[in-house]
């Protein structure tokens, strides 16, 4: 599998998506795990609703959420309120007994804010018809790492 | 009807080559994991391997990887096991299953089986 | 690989009689458990999946039950064309495994 870069900007919302054969993962639960280590175990963080039927309704764990759309065969991860601690290696993951396929790996990048070091006069306020949350966007910048690149720093 | 029709019975010599195959029809055939399944004479059930015809991903039994090769042709809706050189212990039934996952569970199971072919390796 | 192990290997009961089969795995398989039933030159007929979950089309004398490790399959009344072998088959890991069989012959 080649890895997939996922960029979020930390304090935001980062939306990772995971496509999939919706035929061939029929009927699956999916899964978030983080991989702990290059070659360790991938650390579940959240999976999909136990009846696969309702999939579609999103599932929280502390700040990431899923929610699978499986006719589509498109498995969404949220991860809110992005953190520099957030960045790494994670799987998603199509669920049968007690095996795992992996879906698609997915490394995630954290963004310093770039607001964090403005004058409080440079920040920009929403006008009184916008909402705070609608000039709150979510981020997700996406790209396959090349060739050679490395997810995790070389162990000695 | 769903049915998977299998290729009839061979008789080999060690040594030799040999490909049987499994007809799907009745239902969308790449759209659902095809087993293969290994019964020798008197015994029990062994599972060798799966394939998903849609994309020709597949998995082996470790005791059977480098042993035999699993493969599908989609554009006829046919699985495939094949050997490139049979031993006399290779004498069994062969069957083919179709695995379908019950979303209850999330796991498969073989709910519909080809007829078998019975393969015969002497010298 | 998870060894599954069947127990009895034969048994002989009468039509009409309440006959259980058993199946143990070597680690636990949660309710990963499929039973199937096999008869002589016939390729094996999914019973039931999920443990214990009847296929369509099976007769509801048949059910399975357990969890874990430790399964049964049960035939409450026996009819004649129930005279078979019996296979159970986990799901939950690769390589799927099947159990040895057990022989249910007519008394």
């Known amino acids: 599998h080649n890895t997939t870069v996922f960029q979020g900007v930390a304090g935001q919302s980062l939306q990772v998506s995971c496509p999939y054969d919706s035929m061939k993962h029929w009927g699956r639960r999916k899964a978030w795990c983080r991989q702990l280590g290059e070659k360790g175990p991938c650390q579940r963080v959240v999976s999909t609703h136990n009846l696969w039927l309702l999939s579609f309704l999103r599932r929280w764990n502390g700040s990431t959420a899923i929610t699978d759309d499986t006719l589509g065969g498109t498995l969404t991860i949220t991860l809110r309120n992005l953190q520099p601690h957030d960045a790494g290696l994670y799987q998603c993951q199509s669920l049968h007994g007690s095996e795992a396929d992996t879906l698609r790996k997915v490394l995630v990048e954290v963004l310093a804010d770039p607001l964090d070091h403005r004058d409080a006069g440079d920040l920009w306020f929403p006008g009184e018809s916008e909402s705070f949350e609608d000039a709150h966007v979510e981020h997700s910048i996406s790209r396959s790492l090349l060739e050679g690149e490395i997810p995790f720093p070389p162990t000695s | 009807e769903v049915q998977l029709v299998q290729s009839g019975a061979e008789v080999k010599k060690p040594g030799e080559s040999l490909k049987i195959s499994c007809k799907g029809s009745?239902?969308?055939?790449?759209?659902?994991?095809i087993a293969w399944v290994r019964q020798m004479p008197g015994k029990g059930l062994e599972w060798m391997g799966i394939?998903?015809?849609?994309?020709?991903?597949?998995r082996y039994s470790p005791s059977f990887q480098g042993q035999v090769t699993i493969s599908a042709d989609k554009s006829i809706s046919t699985a495939y096991l094949q050997w490139s050189s049979l031993k006399a212990s290779d004498t069994a039934m062969y069957f083919c299953?179709?695995?379908?996952?019950?979303?209850?569970?999330?796991?498969?199971?073989?709910?519909?089986w080809g007829q078998g072919t019975l393969v015969t390796v002497s010298s | 690989d998870i060894q599954m192990t069947q127990s009895p290997s034969s048994v002989s009961a009468s039509v009409g009689d309440r006959v259980t089969i058993t199946c143990r795995a070597s680690?636990?398989?949660?309710?990963?458990l499929a039973w199937y039933q096999q008869k002589p030159g016939k390729a094996p007929k999914l019973l039931i999946y999920?443990?214990?979950t009847l296929q369509n089309g099976v007769p509801s004398r048949f059910s399975g039950s357990g969890s874990g490790t430790d399964f049964t399959l049960t035939i409450s009344s026996l009819q004649p064309e129930d005279f078979a072998t019996y296979f159970c088959?986990?799901?939950?890991?690769?390589?799927?495994?099947f159990g040895q069989g057990t022989k249910l012959e007519i008394k």
């Open positions: 299953a179709r695995q379908r996952t019950f979303y209850y569970d999330s796991s498969d199971y073989f709910d519909y």
């Open positions: 009745g239902y969308s055939f790449t759209s659902y994991w």
């Open positions: 394939i998903y015809p849609g994309d020709s991903d597949t």
């Open positions: 680690q636990g398989i949660s309710s990963w």
């Open positions: 999920a443990a214990s």
């Open positions: 088959q986990q799901a939950d890991s690769f390589p799927r495994t």
